[in-house]
């Protein structure tokens, strides 16, 4: 049966918690990604940013999970207007910011 949206969001949050807690060396070798506007369309915007990181097994599950939340196909090099212009941050900071935002969405009952 299909997973309820609240369960899917909680699973994504738990995966991001795992990443932040299990982080020993710099996440994805300190790779930089485009910062995004954490408002509408956050899942696709996050995927558009993280999909440009390759060869980083730590975030592969997150990339797959975000893909399930984003209704359209996302490929590397593709950016929406949700990107914060010319601002790049480390993947570790990106994941932390995304985690805070998604936990707030969960608390507010915004699952889609």
């Amino acid at each position: 049966s299909p997973v309820p949206p609240s369960t899917a969001l909680k699973e994504l949050i738990e995966e991001l918690v795992n990443i932040t807690q299990n982080q020993k060396a710099p996440l994805c070798n300190g790779s930089m990604v485009w910062s995004i506007n954490l408002t509408a369309g956050v899942y696709c915007a996050a995927l558009e940013s993280l999909i440009n990181v390759s060869g980083c097994s730590a975030i592969e599950k997150t990339q797959r999970m975000l893909n399930g939340f984003c209704p359209h196909k996302v490929s590397a090099g593709q950016f929406s207007s949700l990107r914060v212009r010319d601002t790049k941050i480390e993947v570790a900071q990106f994941v932390k910011d995304l985690l805070v935002h998604l936990k707030k969405l969960f608390r507010e009952g915004q699952f889609n």
């Epitope: 609240s6 909680k10 954490l38 408002t39 805070v100 935002h101 936990k103 707030k104 969960f106 608390r107 009952g109 699952f111």
Partner: antibody, heavy 120, light 112 residues
Framework: QVQLVQSGAEVKKPGASVKVSCKAS????????IHWVRQAPGQRLEWMGR????????KYDPKFQGRVTITRDTSASTAYMELSSLRSEDTAVYYC?????????????WGQGTLVTVSS | DVVMTQSPLSLPVTPGEPASISCRSS???????????LEWYLQKPGQSPQLLIY???NRFSGVPDRFSGSGSGTDFTLKISRVEAEDVGVYYC?????????FGQGTKLEIK
């Protein structure tokens, strides 16, 4: 350590406005919510509203809508609550409180309270 | 709005004796994410409120184990197994599942 420090007591005339501040330290204000709760003498605690300092998303109790404005200055790690068109029944202790930083399940830290007296 | 109704409003207790406070909500306070955000706060004379119990039955860190919470749906209870002199104050139940968030009217616990 985590602290919420509020501005001092105020005495206002009916019809005036009051703005109470709540300065956060020991944590990043953007990582949580800041709520405002008041308590009139001998009355129950009353939730007024809350702000998400990360994106300025605000929710109010409709009872106060139009009279209360919650704002924040993230660079100063401070939240504000302004109440306008004051009347005598607004005499109360006003508290700020933060939602705990993990799943935002409860209020784990409170300010010391600010007494606002409305009197002609 | 969800109305929270507490009883009794006044509770005189002999030290060492148990105490129980009831809280009833006017509608279910199960959040759309599946959690029940029902808390109990104690306000000691001249102090800011302090958290005792969250999500119905979880004791906050540092809260003595003589405090316990239970209930579901619309009926909730706070129990103190053996009241101590330091427990005096006003106890509030609080729901944070639905906006506006609402408190019960408070129960004043005093020592006989």
């Amino acid at each position: 350590q985590v602290q919420l420090v509020q501005s001092g007591a105020e005495v206002k005339k009916p019809g005036a406005s009051v703005k109470v501040s709540c300065k956060a330290s020991g944590f990043n204000i953007k990582d949580t919510y800041i709520h405002w709760v008041r308590q009139a003498p001998g009355q129950r605690l009353e939730w007024m509203g809350r702000i998400d300092p990360a994106n300025d998303n605000i929710k109010y109790d409709p009872k106060f809508q139009g009279r209360v404005t919650i704002t924040r200055d993230t660079s100063a790690s401070t939240a504000y609550m302004e109440l306008s068109s004051l009347r005598s029944e607004d005499t109360a202790v006003y508290y700020c409180a933060r939602s705990e930083e993990n799943w935002y399940d409860f209020f784990d830290y409170w300010g010391q309270g600010t007494l606002v007296t409305v009197s002609s | 709005d969800v109305v929270m109704t507490q009883s009794p409003l006044s509770l005189p207790v002999t030290p060492g004796e148990p105490a129980s406070i009831s809280c009833r909500s006017s509608q279910s306070i199960v959040h759309s994410n599946g959690n029940t955000y029902l808390e109990w706060y104690l306000q000691k004379p001249g102090q800011s409120p302090q958290l005792l119990i969250y999500k119905v039955s979880n004791r906050f860190s540092g809260v003595p184990d003589r405090f316990s919470g239970s209930g579901s749906g619309t009926d909730f209870t706070l129990k103190i197994s053996r009241v101590e002199a330091e427990d005096v104050g006003v106890y509030y139940c609080f729901q944070s599942s639905h906006v506006p968030l609402t408190f019960g009217q408070g129960t004043k616990l005093e020592i006989k």
